[in-house]
Interface confidence: low
């Protein structure tokens, strides 16, 4: 079947990294510089992505695969294939149209990206606040006040809500 198909369409023999050149009797020509074809049988090569400005080259373009970009330090990728770079903020901040702004009281952000989120409401789970929240950290909920009353059985300290100082990226 493959042989039959190739007799019908000589372009199907052209491997990735080449294109089927109609101007040269459908000879398989190598992709020109700064272009690529990732599959066989293509009649054109695609232009390589250029990583410019805050974009930096993570993987160089080759004749068979496009370049891949990421962002310079101080920025992080957004969108499919890192189509955008967004400015990092500090922990305890969120990015607004006017730049990085501190989280409002009662909210926190433990990452360099994303928005400020409200502190956990411990009372909803019948617990009390063991460690107060900050702009960078959520509150840590502990046993309810009743559990800590005199004469109550010994209390095991609760595990922290998240690893102290750990900011997932």
């Amino acid at each position: 079947f493959e042989r039959t198909r190739s007799l019908q369409d000589p372009c199907s023999n052209c491997p990735a990294g080449t294109f089927c050149d109609n101007n040269r009797n459908q000879i398989c020509s190598p992709c020109p510089p700064n272009s690529f074809s990732s599959a066989g049988g293509q009649r054109t090569c695609d232009i390589c992505r250029q990583c410019k400005g805050v974009f930096r080259t993570r993987k160089e373009c080759s004749s068979t695969s496009n370049a891949e970009c990421d962002c310079t330090p101080g920025f992080h990728c957004l969108g499919a294939g890192c189509s955008m770079c967004e400015q990092d903020c500090k922990q305890g901040q969120e990015l607004t149209k006017k730049g990085c702004k501190d989280c409002c009281f009662g909210t926190f952000n433990d990452q360099k990206r994303g928005i400020c989120r409200p502190w956990t409401n411990c009372s909803l789970d019948g617990k009390s606040v063991l460690v107060n929240g900050t702009k960078e950290r959520d509150v840590v909920c502990g046993p309810s006040p009743a559990d800590l009353s005199p004469g109550a059985s010994s209390v095991t300290p609760p595990a922290p809500a998240r690893e102290p100082g750990h900011s997932p990226q």
């Epitope: 930096r56 080259t57 993570r58 993987k59 990421d70 962002c71 310079t72 330090p73």
Partner: nanobody
Framework: EVQLVESGGGLVQPGGSLRLSCAAS????????MSWFRQAPGKGLEWVSH????????DYADSVKDRFTISRDNARNSLYLQMNSLRAEDTAVYYC???????????????WGQGTLVTVSS
């Protein structure tokens, strides 16, 4: 020990020119891509330009294209940024940085200078 030391900053009027220098030591300068970054007051870090080790590959941010020129002198272990037609919005601390080539596939800049302040004001 790797060292990068910028110089050449100062106060200049709009439309004027400055040439920044970055003196490198402690590594094989010609093996590394070098970049200029800047940080305007209260703003994030902005990439300005980079140049390959041999000087054959050069690129600029759109905001400085046709006004700034990056160059290097590998014999002198020096990186330069010629800044012409300066505008108020070019006011910033300018940093040179070395790209870490020991970590392929990353964009880490493993060594930075201390920065030099450029103020564009009348």
């Amino acid at each position: 020990e790797v060292q990068l030391v910028e110089s050449g900053g100062g106060l200049v009027q709009p439309g004027g020119s400055l040439r920044l220098s970055c003196a490198a030591s402690g590594f094989a300068f010609s093996d590394y891509y070098m970049s200029w970054f800047r940080q305007a007051p209260g703003k994030g870090l902005e990439w300005v330009s980079h140049i390959s080790g041999s000087g054959t590959t050069i690129d600029y941010a759109d905001s400085v294209k046709d006004r700034f020129t990056i160059s290097r002198d590998n014999a002198r272990n020096s990186l330069y940024l010629q800044m012409n037609s300066l505008r108020a919005e070019d006011t910033a601390v300018y940093y040179c940085a070395r790209e870490d080539i020991r970590m392929p596939g990353t964009t880490d800049f493993d060594h930075w200078g201390q920065g030099t302040l450029v103020t564009v004001s009348s």
